[in-house]
Amino acid sequence: KETAFVEVVLFESSPSGDYTTYTTGLTGRFSRAGATLSAEGEIVQMHPLGLCNNNDEEDLYEYGWVGVVKLEQPELDPKPCLTVLGKAKRAVQRGATAVIFDVSENPEAIDQLNQGSEDPLKRPVVYVKGADAIKLMNIVNKQKVARARIQHRPPRQPTEYFDM
């Protein structure tokens, strides 16, 4: 369970057309459900019910986004449509380059994600909790375009990784 170093860059545009970037760093863990490798993409927040269906006729969302999923307390979500691992798989099927789970309210999900899988996903599946999860929630609450970069070693300089 290696540390995942996540950098989130918020892009805030001004009326003149210029934009400012704000970088926030947080840490999570790579789970055994996925690969321990770097990934980068625009953040797309996945509703717990938004990963339930599997309609063949669906238009696939563009590839290369980072899915963020907040898990609820198990007792408040007694009949989820998919397991946590199933949700990760569905997100990757739909084009996610990585999935980040906020497990703050469902720490049992960590064990589910770390059960040795014979067929782990080829994309990273990261979990965050506590203060790091709060940071992430605050970012997606800001309603600005945001990109996440997940690395398995500490970032050197944020500007090194983002082509502005």
């Epitope: 996945m46 938004g50 269906n53 669906e58 408040l76 309603q143």
Partner: antibody, heavy 119, light 107 residues
């Protein structure tokens, strides 16, 4: 500031197709899911369907064969198409948004568009 | 599908009264309940979510409570601006069912 605005024809003939547009501003499809609901005259609210942040959709099972929801992210618009219209499809059609970080209610609504199905 | 049964359908009250509207779910919905207010000719507006959390900007005379299958919306010190129809709604599962509504009128 957050806005959702429905537009479309006020009158549609039976058996025809209804096409509505919801134009949104002040929030991102990356974080919010857009739902369609309707309200027959003098009656309660009925959920029709949703387009999730990832672009996939879910529909009310009773309407699924006739209903399609899509979007154009560049224009920040969501579309509803309902075919084989019947007089019972008359009502006010609303688009509304739902935050995707866990379970959340509909926190902003459009003002609605009245649709009458009549010959 | 989970059914939401709301009562009463009509409620007549005097300004200054405290009133209660109830919502019964056909199965345990774990508190994932919202209350909306709809004034004549307008779209619904969110009042309460997660059974008892007050939406930002909503006056504190509105409150929600309950758990399991039984939920209530209480309006304290009824004001003229509160005359509307109120709906409960579950939002943790399809098809996001609403109650049939309670139309509140003044005596």
């Amino acid at each position: 500031q957050v806005q959702l605005k429905e537009s479309g024809p006020g009158l549609v003939q039976p058996s025809q197709t209804l096409s509505l547009t919801c134009t949104v501003s002040g929030f991102s499809f990356n974080y919010y899911n857009v739902h369609w609901l309707r309200q027959p005259p003098g009656k309660g609210l009925e959920w029709l369907g949703v387009i999730w942040s990832g672009g996939n959709r879910d529909y009310n099972s009773a309407l699924k064969p006739r209903l399609r929801i899509s979007r154009d992210t560049s224009k920040t618009q969501v579309f509803l198409t309902l075919n084989s219209l019947q007089t019972e499809d008359t009502g006010i059609y609303y688009c509304t948004r739902m935050w995707g970080y866990g379970y959340n209610p509909f926190d902003h609504w459009g003002q609605g568009v009245m649709v009458t199905v009549s010959s | 599908d989970i059914q939401m049964t709301q009562s009463p359908s009509f409620l007549s009250a005097s300004l200054g009264d405290n009133i209660t509207i109830t919502c019964h779910a056909s199965q345990d919905i774990k508190g994932w309940l919202a209350w909306y207010q709809q004034k004549s000719g307008n779209a619904p507006e969110l009042l309460i979510y997660k059974a008892s959390s007050l939406q930002s900007g909503v006056p504190s005379r509105f409150s929600g409570g309950g758990s399991g299958t039984e939920y209530v919306l209480t309006i304290s010190n009824l004001q003229p601006d509160d005359i509307a129809t109120y709906y409960c709604q579950l939002y943790h599962s399809f098809p996001f069912t609403f109650g049939s509504g309670t139309k509140l009128e003044t005596k």
